[in-house]
Interface confidence: medium
C-alpha cells in the first residue's frame, strides 16, 4: 500500500468507504421513490491524519494550516473522490419513471 | 439567495470561503518555493446544516442518515466546489521554474 493509504490511527479508523443499510424512510424518499426499497449506501467516513489520502495540494495546505491554527482551520475531511451510479424508479404524476443518479453512492474516498 | 444559501446558525457560521494569510514557512514550502513569499489561502470552513449548499444527492443522503445515526454517520463537510489556479516559482536542480497549480486555492464551497 502507498504511504498515503496506511492509517496511523489503527485499522479502519481513517477515511475509507463504509456501507450503511438504509430504507427509503431513513433516506426521506418514501414519498417519491418506489425502488429500490432499501439502499446499501456507500459513504466516506473516517479521520484524515497528515498525508493520508490527500486529494490535492489544497488538502496538504489545509493540514499544514490546521496544525498551526487548529481553532481556525479544520483538518481535511473525508469525502467521495468518485461516485457509482444508481437507478431509482420514481413516482410521477402519470405513473413511474426511470432515473439514473450519478452522484448518489460513493465509490472511493479521499481527504480534502 | 436560494434557501440552500441561508445559514440557520447565524451569519458566517455555515460553510463558506475564508481567507487565511500564510507564509511559505506556515505552508511547509520554504525549501522548494521561491515566490510568492506569502499566500492568501482561500479555503472552505463552516458548518453544514441540513439543506445548506448540498453538493449533490449523496450530501442529502448523508445528512438524513446523520440525523438518524449521528454516532455512525458524520454530517456533510464543507469542501471546495471548485478551485482557482495559482502560479508558484519553484526551485529546481537547474534554477527556477514557473508552475501553475489548479487545485490549490478554493474558489467556492459546498457541503458533501
Amino acid at each position: 500500500a502507498r504511504n498515503g493509504d496506511r492509517c496511523p490511527l489503527g485499522p479502519g479508523r481513517c477515511c475509507r468507504l463504509h456501507t450503511v443499510h438504509a430504507s427509503l424512510e431513513d433516506l426521506g424518499w418514501a414519498d417519491w421513490v418506489l425502488s429500490p426499497r432499501e439502499v446499501q449506501v456507500t459513504m466516506c467516513i473516517g479521520a484524515c491524519p497528515s498525508q493520508f489520502r490527500e486529494a490535492n495540494m489544497h488538502a496538504q495546505i489545509k493540514m499544514n494550516l490546521h496544525r498551526l491554527k487548529p481553532d481556525t482551520v479544520p483538518a481535511p475531511c473525508c469525502v467521495p473522490a468518485s461516485y457509482n451510479p444508481m437507478v431509482l424508479i420514481q413516482k410521477t404524476d402519470t405513473g413511474v419513471s426511470l432515473q439514473t443518479y450519478d452522484d448518489l453512492l460513493a465509490k472511493d474516498c479521499h481527504c480534502v | 439567495a436560494r434557501n440552500g444559501d441561508r445559514c440557520p446558525l447565524g451569519p458566517g457560521r455555515c460553510c463558506r470561503l475564508h481567507t487565511v494569510h500564510a507564509s511559505l514557512e506556515d505552508l511547509g514550502w520554504a525549501d522548494w518555493v521561491l515566490s510568492p513569499r506569502e499566500v492568501q489561502v482561500t479555503m472552505c470552513i463552516g458548518a453544514c446544516p441540513s439543506q445548506f449548499r448540498e453538493a449533490n444527492m449523496h450530501a442529502q443522503i448523508k445528512m438524513n442518515l446523520h440525523r438518524l445515526k449521528p454516532d455512525t454517520v458524520p454530517a456533510p463537510c464543507c469542501v471546495p466546489a471548485s478551485y482557482n489556479p495559482m502560479v508558484l516559482i519553484q526551485k529546481t536542480d537547474t534554477g527556477v521554474s514557473l508552475q501553475t497549480y489548479d487545485d490549490l486555492l478554493a474558489k467556492d464551497c459546498h457541503c458533501v
Epitope: 425502488s35 451510479p85 444508481m86 437507478v87 | -
Partner: antibody
Framework: QVQLQQSGPELVKPGASVKLSCKAS????????INWVKQRPGQGLEWIGW????????KYNEKFKGKATLTVDTSSSTAYMELHSLTSEDSAVYFC???????????WGQGTTLTVSS | DIVLTQSPATLSVTPGDRVSLSCRAS??????LHWYQQKSHESPRLLIK???QSISGIPSRFSGSGSGTDFTLSINSVETEDFGMYFC?????????FGGGTKLEIK
C-alpha cells in the same frame, strides 16, 4: 440466498391465456423488483415489464401492453405474469428476474417454457 | 427504442485466448450498459454492470469498458466454462433493450 422458482412448462392452444408464476425466497419479497424477460428459441432477450411488489405498481414495454399482465401476491412471495390471446409468436422461454438496483438483473429464475400449439 | 448491436455474431476461439465482444448503441447511453452470460439451457448471469463495474463472484478475467455508444466485454484468458452466449442490456431508458448476442464457441 436469493432464489426465484418458476412454474413448469406449459402447452396451450392458440387464443387461450396462461398464467406463469415466480416464487421468491431468501429475501424480503417487497425489497426487490420483479422483471419478466422473453426469449424465443435461438434468439435474444426481450424485456416485458417490471412490477413493484410492495403495492403492485407496474411498467410495461409498449410492445407487451395488452399481451402481458403482471401481478404479485405478497402473502406467498410470488409474482405472476398472465399472457393473453396466445399465438405461436408467444412460444418462448419466459424468465423472471429480481433486481436490487433497478438498472440490471441480479437474480434470474430458471425459466418457464411456453409452447403455443393446436 | 434504443437498439443494441452486438458483434461479431459468432466468435470461435481457443482456450487461453484473449477476446473482445462489442456492443454498439443506436444513441448515447452514457455507461448504463450491463453484460450477461448465458449457457445453453440456463438462465442469464450478470457479469458486468454499468459498463465496467465488476460483480461479486464473477471471475476477474471478465472486464468491461466503454461509454456513450461503444462498449466492449473482454475475457483476458478464455476458459472452457466461458463458452456460450453473451448479451448486453441498456438501462438508459425504458424499455430496457438487449443486444442480439454474441456466441462464443470453441475453435
Amino acid at each position: 440466498q436469493v432464489q426465484l422458482q418458476q412454474s413448469g412448462p406449459e402447452l396451450v392452444k392458440p387464443g387461450a391465456s396462461v398464467k406463469l408464476s415466480c416464487k421468491a425466497s431468501g429475501y424480503t419479497f417487497t425489497s426487490y423488483d420483479i422483471n419478466w424477460v422473453k426469449q424465443r428459441p435461438g434468439q435474444g432477450l426481450e424485456w416485458i415489464g417490471w412490477i413493484y411488489p410492495r403495492d403492485g405498481i407496474s411498467k410495461y414495454n409498449e410492445k407487451f401492453k395488452g399481451k402481458a399482465t403482471l401481478t404479485v401476491d405478497t402473502s406467498s412471495s410470488t409474482a405472476y405474469m398472465e399472457l393473453h390471446s396466445l399465438t405461436s409468436e408467444d412460444s418462448a422461454v419466459y424468465f423472471c428476474a429480481g433486481t436490487y438496483d433497478p438498472a440490471y438483473f441480479d437474480y434470474w429464475g430458471q425459466g418457464t417454457t411456453l409452447t403455443v400449439s393446436s | 427504442d434504443i437498439v443494441l448491436t452486438q458483434s461479431p455474431a459468432t466468435l470461435s476461439v481457443t482456450p487461453g485466448d484473449r477476446v473482445s465482444l462489442s456492443c454498439r448503441a443506436s444513441q448515447s447511453i452514457s455507461y448504463y450498459l450491463h453484460w450477461y452470460q448465458q449457457k445453453s439451457h440456463e438462465s442469464p448471469r450478470l457479469l458486468i454492470k454499468y459498463a465496467s463495474q465488476s460483480i461479486s463472484g464473477i471471475p476477474s478475467r471478465f472486464s468491461g469498458s466503454g461509454s456513450g455508444t461503444d462498449f466492449t466485454l473482454s475475457i483476458n484468458s478464455v476458459e472452457t466454462e466461458d463458452f456460450g452466449m453473451y448479451f448486453c442490456q441498456q438501462s438508459n431508458s425504458w424499455p430496457y433493450t438487449f443486444g442480439g448476442g454474441t456466441k462464443l464457441e470453441i475453435k
